[in-house]
Interface confidence: low
């Protein structure tokens, strides 16, 4: 079955259908008579029970809370409750980019080596029965592909294949037309024994935090075996007892390259942790690449343009 929504923090684009599926679904079927409730809270607002009367955009089906569509004011915390089982999600609804066919903050980056097998298949299992047609766009220009239900690209990668690929599913619900967009930033890299290491994701990340809480900054890179990934912060690393570098995780690819991930954990965030650079660097004989994180107090979020924000 469609996997339940296990991620506790979710970012979604306004105007698209969206659903939350709780993770005790099989259990809920067995206990049909058990009271099952969905709640929302946002800001100072207390838990408000959700039902189809709450909004014409909300639908409840078995294990799922559906939004038709999700809008900016749906941002908040959502709870599912059944007997002594509770599941919580934090939903952040972001503005759609009206000047593009996709929203930059909702792009999945993938790296494909030149001459290696390259494939994009447009599928959306949850809404499959409602989808009328699906289109695949490259850099917001529609690609003419035979199959308009599940358009697919299968080929050996060339440098010309680099770009933004958007799968757009068009579907009807209660007489209205909706679309769901999934976009991939495909980067084609040289097929060679040593790659130029690259950090994944934006170069500058503003992270909204609350004082006294904890945050985990994740730094991921594609690199060679002998390359190193490290964090730099403050005048002297290790001076803050609340900052901890977690153990580096590495997974090898068949080509002998590595995907590495290193987390910087900041506990009990204080004023001294705000508005300073936490730099993650990947270094190799071929050069270095650095990305930066800046912690910003949640109350100050409004001062920063939305496009530079990250979760």
């Amino acid at each position: 079955a469609e996997s339940c929504t296990s991620r506790p923090h979710i970012t979604v684009v306004e105007g698209e259908p969206f659903y939350l599926k709780h993770c005790s679904c099989s259990l809920a079927h067995e206990i049909e008579t058990t009271t099952k409730s969905w709640y929302k809270s946002s800001g100072s607002q207390e838990h408000v029970e959700l039902n189809p009367r709450s909004s014409s955009r909300i639908a409840l089906h078995d294990c799922v809370l559906e939004f038709w569509p999700v809008e900016l004011n749906d941002t908040g915390s959502y709870f599912f409750q059944m007997k002594n089982y509770t599941q919580k999600w934090k939903l952040n609804v972001i503005r759609r980019n009206k000047h593009s066919c996709f929203t930059e903050r909702q792009v999945t980056s993938k790296i494909v080596e030149v001459k290696k097998f390259f494939q994009i298949t447009c599928e959306n299992s949850y809404y499959q029965t409602l989808v009328n047609s699906t289109s695949l766009y490259k850099n917001c220009k529609k690609l003419l592909l035979e199959n308009n239900k599940n358009p697919t690209i299968k080929k050996n990668a060339e440098f010309e294949d680099q770009g933004y690929y958007s799968c757009v599913h068009f579907l009807h619900h209660n007489g209205k037309l909706f679309n769901i967009t999934k976009t991939f930033n495909i980067t084609i890299v040289e097929d060679r024994s040593n790659i130029v290491p690259v950090l994944l994701g934006p170069k500058l990340n503003h992270v909204a935090v609350e004082l006294g809480k904890n945050v985990r900054l994740n730094c991921s890179a594609l690199l060679n075996e002998e390359d190193v990934i490290y964090w730099m912060f403050g005048e002297e690393n290790g001076s803050d007892p609340n900052i901890h570098e977690e153990k580096e995780m590495r997974i090898m690819t068949p080509e002998g390259k590595w995907h590495a991930s290193k987390v910087l954990r900041i506990e009990n965030i204080g004023e001294s942790n705000l508005n300073v650079l936490y730099n993650c660097t990947v270094a190799s004989t071929g050069g270095t690449d650095t990305k930066s994180f800046i912690l910003v107090r949640k109350a100050d979020m409004a001062d920063i343009p939305g496009h530079v924000f990250t979760r």
């Epitope: 991620r7 993938k110 290696k116 494939q119 599928e123 697919t152 068949p254 995907h259």
Partner: nanobody, 126 residues
Framework: EVQLVESGGGLVQPGGSLRLSCAAS????????ISWFRQAPGQEREVVSC????????IYADSVKGRFTISSDNAKNTVYLQMNSLKPEDTAVYYC???????????????????WGQGTQVTVSS
């Protein structure tokens, strides 16, 4: 409807072998990345191995390299995990997962899967 059904788990002595199967349906099998994850009690879920049936990419976590082998049978839409030289620390619930937006090459098993199976218990004990 997408389905991932695992089988083959059980109790085995240290040094023994098991073969896990993951039968997939409801999506384009050769356009996906199929991963095996595991979760031991009180531990975080970790990726063990991944295969892309479309391009033959395979990856392994360091802890299982040389002991585990992942393979796929495209005709049966099934992925196998052959586990040899099992150790007590391999004890966990093993989950099959699918990333149906896989696009080839280096990212097998690294993105959050779209779908998960129910899991099968593997216990290594004397």
């Amino acid at each position: 409807e997408v389905q991932l059904v695992e089988s083959g788990g059980g109790l085995v002595q240290p040094g023994g072998s098991l073969r896990l199967s993951c039968a997939a349906s409801g999506f384009t099998f050769d356009g996906a990345a199929i991963s095996w994850f595991r979760q031991a009690p009180g531990q975080e879920r970790e990726v063990v191995s991944c295969v892309s049936p479309g391009d033959g990419t395979t990856i392994y976590a360091d802890s299982v390299k040389g002991r585990f082998t992942i393979s796929s049978d495209n005709a049966k839409n099934t992925v196998y995990l052959q586990m040899n030289s099992l150790k007590p620390e391999d004890t966990a619930v093993y989950y099959c997962a699918a990333d149906t937006y896989y696009s080839g090459g280096a990212h097998c098993g690294l993105l959050s899967p779209d779908y998960w199976g129910q899991g099968t218990q593997v216990t290594v004990s004397s």
